[in-house]
Interface confidence: low
């Protein structure tokens, strides 16, 4: 786990703001282990928050919190909720794996101890906002955010290298004739041969290609490529992506509140990389071709990293 820079100062003062402050107990002081007579953010306001702008979307997989002392008083936040945003405008409440009510985190029990709360699943956000719900005397906080850079996770997951086995690649259907079988396992980037891509039995937008990673992976992008067969160029121009944790319930990839239509290939040989923002934490991934030239034909790679790399 990597500290994102509250304690080190890598997160600068201007990135830390709050709904208000008590006296000199400013947001910029809300840094884990900060020392001095005034050494934390504090506020008397009941409906308060403190916000950190990470300047770019990051994976945040935990928060360490600490209170502070003022003379003989212990000041700390005992319970809080977390909200997060990619743009600073549209905020979501962190709910963990639940689709129900918000998640209330248990914070500190004294002024000096450090409580580490883990976000499972991790939060992908540029902005993170902590709202105290219960506190001792005043909401008072020193903290560190734990996480990593989104861009540190764009390794090929194994379509081309065959680290992803044939059995892990399936499809709604595949085209076969007496000359060739265009099976799902042929959907590997740069694959060569007589039948060197996946092609469905029929060309329609209901067809899909599926990869089962066999465990939860963080998927940050996909690379797609078409194919040339008997002088005919075939490639997918547009596609959708869906994901699932159980292989039964599928969720289409949304961006800015809309189903994202990915722009694919423009010829049969040039690989095109599409990044997923925010990344997907998923076991299963499906590509749904929506428009194509001549025939649906797909070779691909998935980019990302293992989800446990995040913890």
């Amino acid at each position: 786990q990597t500290p994102l820079g509250m304690a080190s100062g890598h997160i600068r003062d201007f990135q830390i703001t709050a709904s208000g402050q008590y006296g000199q107990w400013a947001p910029k002081l809300a840094r884990l282990h900060y020392s001095g007579s005034i050494n934390a953010w504090s506020t008397k306001e009941p409906f308060s928050w403190i916000k950190v702008d990470l300047l770019a979307p990051m994976i945040i997989h935990g928060i360490k919190t600490q209170g502070a002392r003022q003379k003989f008083s212990s000041l700390y936040i005992s319970q809080f909720i977390i909200m997060y945003s990619l743009d600073g405008k549209k905020w979501q409440t962190y709910r963990g794996n639940s689709t129900g009510t918000l998640m209330v985190f248990f914070g500190n029990v004294d002024s000096s101890g450090i409580k580490h709360n883990i976000f499972n699943p991790p939060i992908i956000a540029r902005y993170i906002r902590l709202h105290p719900t219960h506190y001792s005397i005043r909401s008072t906080l020193r903290m560190e955010l734990m996480g990593c850079d989104l861009n540190s996770c764009s390794m090929p997951l194994g379509m081309e290298s065959k680290a992803i086995s044939d059995a892990q690649i399936t499809a709604s259907s595949y085209f076969t004739n007496m000359f060739a079988t265009w099976s799902p396992s042929k959907a590997r980037l740069h694959l060569q041969g007589r039948s060197n891509a996946w092609r469905p039995q029929v060309n329609n937008p209901k067809e899909w290609l599926q990869v089962d990673f066999q465990k939860t992976m963080k998927v940050t992008g996909v690379t797609t490529q078409g194919v040339k067969s008997l002088l005919t160029s075939m490639y997918v121009k547009e596609f959708l992506i869906s994901s699932s944790q159980d292989g039964h319930q599928w969720t289409l990839f949304f961006q800015n509140g809309k189903v994202k239509v990915f722009q694919g290939n423009q010829d049969s040989f040039t690989p095109v990389v599409n990044s997923l923002d925010p990344p997907l934490l998923t076991r299963y991934l499906r590509i749904h071709p929506q428009s194509w030239v001549h025939q649906i034909a797909l070779r691909m790679e998935v980019l990302g990293c293992e989800a446990q790399d995040l913890y």
């Epitope: 009941p46 979501q92 009510t101 209330v104 719900t133």
Partner: antibody, heavy 121, light 106 residues
Amino acid sequence: QVQLVQSGAEVKKPGSSVMVSCKASGGTFSSFGISWVRQAPGQGLEWVGGIIPIFGTANTARNFQNRVTITADEFTSTAYIRLRSLRSEDTAVYYCVGGRDAYSFDGFDVWGQGTMVTVSS
Amino acid sequence: SSGLTQPHSVSVSPGQTANITCSRDKLGHKFASWYQQKPGQSPALLIYQDSKRPSGIPERFSGSNSGNTATLTISGTQAMDEADYYCQAWDNTTAVFGGGTKLTVL
């Protein structure tokens, strides 16, 4: 799924106060965002204010800040709105509404049946 | 908080598509919700987070939100869709509603 049941209709004189209650059942009341929305006869919806029981503090629309008190009792899973210094333009149906998100960014997905408050001399 | 602007009324023939707009400066920066209210009933949530449908809401209801305008689209409008429709968004921690649009199915 949370259900919200409100108290009955009220008829009040101008200058007096009214309190309407809203009892929640079937969910986690404490972290559920409860708001009050009113609708004058033949008019649109107007947000009066809201409360998140775990915060214990209410958030009120600017127009009502001096006249409205919103409270919640976690033990009985009941939210209350009290409106003071009533005037005829406060005549409306008052809805207790809830959302699974503290700030109901997911929309108000649960609505009480409404309580008609009539202010008349 | 400034309110949200909706057309007072929209008319549509059965089976046609109705679009109800809701506008305010930079509304696309906020999440918009939509509600349907039939006479004598409490409003009901139709769309949240711009385009998501709660369970039980028919697929013919869809939403979008960008720029200064959120739009509720009802495709294949039915007589039962005749109702008042309200948009709603949050201005910091204050909820604001549109004035409402009466949808008439001719």
